[in-house]
């Protein structure tokens, strides 16, 4: 495939990445799959600057990101190291709360109304943000 040099229509370019902001809600796994089908991934926040950019675009709305601990350790969907990476949890989060009564704890991370992160039940239908890097090879065949 060819290297992507500009963002697809309706995506927003920022710091060599392209972002797409949903206006509807999906469960985390469905949001994750949506982004993958777009040759992208749920947003991976690697800096305070990127956090502010995403926060500005989503507003005060619960929004999924590409961070989960469904297998135990916290993991970013693109393989970015959680331990050494940027974190912006709300105070006392993540808490893996069981009190919702839906079964299990809380395994998926989202932006809250103030932008800081919370873990929540992955089945909740929140908005989501997809991200893809401009410098990565596209799956699409090159234009002739």
């Amino acid at each position: 495939g060819s290297e992507r040099t500009c963002c697809p229509v309706n995506w927003v370019e920022h710091e060599r990445s392209c972002y797409w902001f949903s206006r509807s809600g999906k469960a985390w796994a469905d949001a994750d799959n949506y982004c993958r089908l777009e040759d992208a991934h749920l947003v991976v926040v690697t800096s305070w600057e990127e956090q502010k950019f995403v926060q500005h675009h989503i507003g005060p709305v619960n929004t999924w990101m590409g961070l989960h601990d469904q297998n135990g350790p916290w993991k970013w969907v693109d393989g970015t190291d959680y331990e050494t990476g940027f974190k912006n949890w709300r105070p006392e989060q993540p808490d893996d709360w069981y009190g919702h009564g839906l079964g299990g704890g809380e395994d998926c991370a989202h932006f809250t109304d103030d932008g800081r992160w919370n873990d929540d039940v992955c089945q909740r239908p929140y908005r989501w943000v997809c991200e893809t890097e401009l410098d990565k090879a596209s799956q699409e065949p090159p234009l002739l």
């Epitope: 601990d69 469904q70 297998n71 135990g72 350790p73 916290w74 959680y82 331990e83 974190k87 949890w89 105070p91 006392e92 989060q93 993540p94 808490d95 893996d96 709360w97 069981y98 009190g99 079964g103 299990g104 704890g105």
Partner: antibody, heavy 114, light 107 residues
Framework: EVQLVESGGGLVKPGGSLRLSCAAS????????MNWVRQAPGKGLEWVSS????????YYADSVKGRFTISRDNAKNSLYLQMNSLRAEDTAVYYC???????WGQGTLVTISS | DIQMTQSPSSLSASVGDRITITCRAS??????LAWFQQKPGKAPKSLIS???SLQSGVPSKFSGSGSGTDFTLTISSLQPEDFATYCC?????????FGQGTKVEIK
């Protein structure tokens, strides 16, 4: 490398007390719930207690409720289990485990005998 | 409390065999199930979480399946290092509960 190291086990008389510690390293301790799980000699695993990342939520098995207290110190990357009114049936290897058990310590043996 | 029942409690098998261990929950637990391996005198090792997700570093000869109340752990080709005790655990709700274990021995 993720490491959990338990300490504080030993031989105690029935009715006595013991405090177990678990020192964590190699991961962001404050991002994870932590647990104590025990295994009596020749028996299966038994969940004992869990504590959320910031101690907001604490859970106990009925068999230890009112006698055991779980706590943590995120500044010290440490998990604790205060065990009071110990009984012979509390004799076991006690393991500390992260989240749902993705990593475990090597265990510390607690023996309750007169 | 949710009871977890494993079968068989023990089995004998040869190197190269494919084996399956079953775990049944007394009520539906969706996919909130983990599998562990334990060798004598050692701490348990996590193999699978969320019923079918292989833990990092665990070889692909291990696989898990199931949802609701019935779950299986399969080892596709037993190797000498796989002879151990295997147990399941539900984390759907507190108190978390374990199966009684299945001891896999050399035939």
């Amino acid at each position: 490398e993720v490491q959990l190291v338990e300490s504080g086990g030993g031989l105690v008389k029935p009715g006595g007390s013991l405090r177990l510690s678990c020192a964590a390293s190699g991961f962001t301790f404050s991002s994870y719930s932590m647990n104590w799980v025990r295994q009596a000699p020749g028996k299966g695993l038994e969940w004992v207690s869990s504590i959320s990342s910031s101690s907001s939520y604490i859970y106990y098995a009925d068999s230890v409720k009112g006698r055991f207290t779980i706590s943590r110190d995120n500044a010290k990357n440490s998990l604790y289990l205060q065990m009071n009114s110990l009984r012979a049936e509390d004799t076991a290897v006690y393991y500390c485990a992260r989240d749902r058990g993705s990593c475990w310590g090597q265990g510390t043996l607690v023996t309750i005998s007169s | 409390d949710i009871q977890m029942t494993q079968s068989p409690s023990s089995l004998s098998a040869s190197v190269g065999d494919r084996i399956t261990i079953t775990c049944r929950a007394s009520q539906g637990i969706s996919n909130y199930l983990a599998w562990f391996q334990q060798k004598p005198g050692k701490a348990p090792k996590s193999l699978i979480s969320a019923a079918s997700s292989l833990q990092s570093g665990v070889p692909s000869k291990f696989s898990g399946s199931g949802s609701g109340t019935d779950f299986t752990l399969t080892i596709s080709s037993l190797q000498p290092e796989d002879f151990a005790t295997y147990c399941c655990q539900q984390y759907h709700s507190y108190p978390w509960t374990f199966g009684q274990g299945t001891k896999v021995e050399i035939k």
